[in-house]
Interface confidence: low
């Protein structure tokens, strides 16, 4: 088992993740581990020399870069917020701010926009991953209601009047809850006509 640096006539290295082909000397050299960079290139007699990334910089993968990448903050102008800080081995982890979704994606989210409101009688369909797409509003299922325009309000079950010792004065709809009344109270005048047999 050869240890870098070793000669390679076919321009490939045994461990593609941790080694790379150096064409000038036709040898395989070690890559630098995450969190480091190449401080001295390899030669036929000496392997790659690595150094730790300076503060506020990182390299995420085994690499043969001569510099570390600069840490970038999550840009609130683009609707992003930080969920994990930058380390020498990992860039700053960002996500869309609450109430926003990712509108532009280039390897990672670059721009978030505000979620659309769902109108009364509907709710946002639950997604596997928060912030991945705009709201898709779906009607409240039977026996449920939602009475606001909101990106996040959920449909709630209609009140069951009998559970409160009351009777139903008006049935619930997708946009309004059931109206309950004391069984001893008369119906309001505008509704009394509907009860004629």
């Amino acid at each position: 088992q050869a240890v870098p640096p070793y000669a390679s006539e076919n321009q490939t290295c045994r461990d593609q993740e941790k080694e790379y082909y150096e064409p000038q000397h036709r040898i395989c050299c070690s890559r630098c581990p995450p969190g480091t960079y190449v401080s001295a290139k390899c030669s036929r007699i000496r392997d790659t020399v690595c150094a730790t990334c300076a503060e506020n910089s990182y390299n995420e993968h085994w690499n043969y870069l001569t510099i570390c990448q600069l840490c970038r903050p999550c840009d609130p102008v683009m609707g992003l917020e930080e969920i994990a800080p930058c380390t020498s081995k990992r860039k700053t982890q960002c996500r869309c701010q609450p109430g926003m979704f990712c509108a532009a994606w280039a390897l990672e989210c670059t721009h978030c926009e505000l979620l659309s409101d769902c109108p009364p009688g509907t709710e946002a369909e639950l997604k596997d991953e928060v912030g991945k797409g705009n709201n898709h509003c779906v009607p409240c299922k039977a026996g449920h209601f939602q009475n606001t325009s909101s990106p996040s309000a959920r449909c709630q079950p209609h009140t069951r009047c009998e559970n409160q010792g009351l009777v139903e004065a008006a049935p619930g709809t997708a946009q309004s809850d059931t109206t309950c009344k004391n069984p001893l109270e008369p119906l309001p005048p505008e509704m009394s006509g509907t009860m004629l047999m």
Epitope: P76, M78, G99, A103, A106, T110, E113, L114
Partner: antibody, heavy 119, light 112 residues
């Protein structure tokens, strides 16, 4: 139709603070960015900072230590407070609502509040 | 900070004639989402500014179609196809790509 109504003109002494209000009527307050822009007499426009109704704010570094932007969502009112006032802070201060889902695009403006700093 | 420049700073116009204002930014305003983050505003005498164009070329609601925005990257243009008397005022470009948002110095448009 949304309207932004700002508080009245103020005269302040150097070193003091001023707090300007901006009340939104006729539309939702939440889920928008609210910016403040100022204009010194006969000069151009300077962006001061912005507030997202979710609670985050960012400021112009030239004013960062002195400006605070807040909001009271229950009254649909945004506030801009500027401290350690100096004569060069004499300006008309505008609040503006940004286009929904877009950075910038100040689509609705308040009428402006003149703040005069004079000893 | 991104520095915005405009030219000309003063523009005398004739009603019915076209007019054009240039705006340059010190760095590209073209975002990876393919939109140019540039706005145009008009401040009429004694009034608050009003949004004319956003994202470089999108007319704001209620803005007459004689106003158009074009350009990409660092060079942008606002065109008025036929100037009307009500178009007088100071025109500002602004970049909302990065905070702090920055405005151009303004172009004063008045009738010859």
């Amino acid at each position: 139709q949304v309207q932004l109504v700002q508080s009245g003109a103020e005269v302040k002494k150097p070193g003091s603070s001023v707090k300007v209000s901006c009340k939104a009527s006729g539309g939702t307050f939440s889920s928008y960015f609210w910016s403040w822009v100022r204009q010194a007499p006969g000069q151009g426009l300077e962006w001061m900072g912005r507030f997202y109704s979710g609670g985050s704010a960012n400021y112009n570094p030239s004013l960062k230590e002195r400006v605070t932007i807040t909001a009271d969502e229950s009254t649909s009112t945004a506030y801009m407070e500027l401290s350690s006032l100096r004569s060069e802070d004499t300006a008309v201060y505008y609040c503006a609502r940004e286009r929904r889902g877009y950075s910038g695009g100040f689509e609705i403006w308040g009428q402006g509040t003149l703040v005069t700093v004079s000893s | 900070d991104i520095v915005m420049t405009q030219s000309p700073l003063s523009l005398p116009v004739t009603p019915g004639e076209p007019a054009s204002i240039s705006c340059r930014s010190s760095q590209s305003l073209l975002h990876s989402n393919s939109y140019n983050y540039l706005d145009w505003y008009l401040q009429k005498p004694g009034q608050s500014p009003q949004l004319l164009i956003y994202l470089g070329s999108y007319r704001a609601s209620g803005v007459p179609d004689r106003f158009s925005g074009s350009g990409s990257g660092t060079d942008f243009t606002l065109k008025i196809s036929r100037v009307e008397a009500e178009d007088v005022g100071v025109y500002y470009c602004m970049q909302p790509l990065q905070t702090p948002f920055t405005f151009g110095p303004g172009t004063k448009v008045d009738i010859k």
